[in-house]
Interface confidence: medium
């Protein structure tokens, strides 16, 4: 026997009190799949939450952060305070890179700087709070006429979020 | 997304030892890999971490024990001179993202070192 | 380097209840603390980041808190999935204390 509820599209739920009728959400409420016996609340994007998108009778609301703060979690379930490049987030609020260390984002943490003699390489621009240590070529790799090395751009990911 | 640790064996005390993580499914370049070990019925100990600019940070414990390096989708961990006190099993682990580096949710299997006489 | 002491080194509890695990760190770690699962004969699973942060796909039951020095993890209605042990891992890094990264000894938890 098909239970009747199952034809009840997303955007509606099946009301037990009026003979398992499809009826729309209410206001701020959705329900994503069809066959659902609530519609669930829609989440607000209040304080230092805000509004990417709408919450529509399908599905729910989301949220980013507002300038200065970043998310974390699942679904931007938290907003963390931003710092500046060259720096950590501590309880303290944001605190300077030891020496030998830096920061080069706005989250995370300050990570040790590149050892280029590791590597037989000499230091072409020295590390700071928030840039990497610049390697050079290796010194059998410089022939006459070279063209002079380019720092390269910070690794990071496009988008990439903490998670 | 993977990652897969290997070079685990029985070995002598003092006979150098190289473990290998190899990474499939992501880059190098955008995160860290750290390496964690545990004895026998014991405890995680974290030994290292490798960033994506090849820069490391060891244990206080681990420094001079073991190196470590990488190329664009390994990462090895070099046991200097083992002892028998190493005996464990060694895993490798993938960060979040190269900024977040403070935890780790992609994890090997381990791979098994054994030292003896 | 900072020391993590992890307490009670086991615990029991029955199906549906709840369990406590506690982390201290010898310094301030600014809540850099995550709680790890582990299973006999696998790796370890992150369960929490940044002290009270849920991992994707963890469940809600699983809740960290604290921060400074005292971290805590709770796992409420236990299910006997549950049966692991758990571990705290903290990072640190300062001029006196030095960067790097340390778990605690790890808390077994038996659920009857």
């Known amino acids: 026997l098909q239970d009747p509820c199952s034809n009840c599209p997303a955007g509606t739920f099946c009301d037990n009190n009026r003979n398992q009728i499809c009826s729309p959400c209410p206001p701020n409420s959705f329900s994503s799949a069809g066959g659902q016996r609530t519609c669930d609340i829609c989440r607000q994007c209040k304080g230092v939450f805000r509004t990417r998108k709408e919450c529509s009778s399908t599905s729910n609301a989301e949220c980013d952060c507002t300038p200065g703060f970043h998310c974390l979690g699942a679904g931007c379930s938290m907003c963390e305070q931003d710092c500046k490049q060259g720096q950590e987030l501590t309880k303290k609020g944001c605190k300077d890179c030891c020496f030998g260390t830096f920061n080069d984002q706005k989250r995370g943490i300050c990570r040790p700087w590149t050892n280029c003699s590791l590597a037989g390489k000499p230091v072409l621009m020295n590390g700071t709070k928030a840039r990497d240590v610049v390697c050079g070529p290796r010194p059998a790799d410089l022939s006459p006429g070279a063209s002079s090395v380019t720092p390269p751009a910070p690794a990071r990911e496009p988008g990439h979020s903490p998670q | 997304q993977s990652v897969e640790e290997s070079g685990g064996r029985l070995v002598t005390p003092g006979t150098p030892l190289t473990l290998t993580c190899t990474v499939s499914g992501f880059s190098l370049t955008y995160y860290a890999v750290t390496w964690v070990r545990q004895p026998p019925g014991k405890g995680l100990e974290w030994i290292g971490v490798?960033?994506?600019?090849?820069a490391t940070a060891f244990a206080t414990w681990a420094k001079g024990r073991f190196t470590m390096s990488k190329n664009s989708t390994t990462v090895a961990l070099k046991v200097t001179s083992p002892t028998t006190e190493d005996t464990a099993t060694y895993f490798c682990?993938?960060?979040?993202?190269?900024?977040?580096?403070?935890?780790?949710?992609?994890w090997g299997q381990g791979t098994l070192v054994t030292v003896s006489s | 380097d900072i020391v993590m002491t992890q307490t009670p080194s086991s615990v029991s509890a029955a199906v549906g209840g709840t369990v406590t695990i506690n982390c201290q760190a010898s310094?301030?770690?600014?809540?850099?603390l995550s709680w790890y699962q582990q299973k006999l004969g696998q790796p370890p699973k992150l369960l929490i980041y940044k002290a009270s942060t849920l991992e994707s796909g963890v469940p809600s039951r699983f809740k960290g808190s604290g921060s400074g020095t005292e971290y805590t993890l709770t796992i409420s209605d236990l299910e006997s999935d549950d049966a692991a042990t758990y571990y705290c891992q903290s990072y640190y890094s300062g001029s006196i204390s030095g960067y790097g990264f340390v778990f605690g000894g790890g808390t077994g938890v038996v659920v009857k």
């Open positions: 682990a993938r960060s979040a993202n190269n900024a977040w580096s403070t935890y780790s949710n992609l």
């Open positions: 310094e301030d770690i600014s809540s850099y």
């Open positions: 490798i960033y994506d600019n090849g």
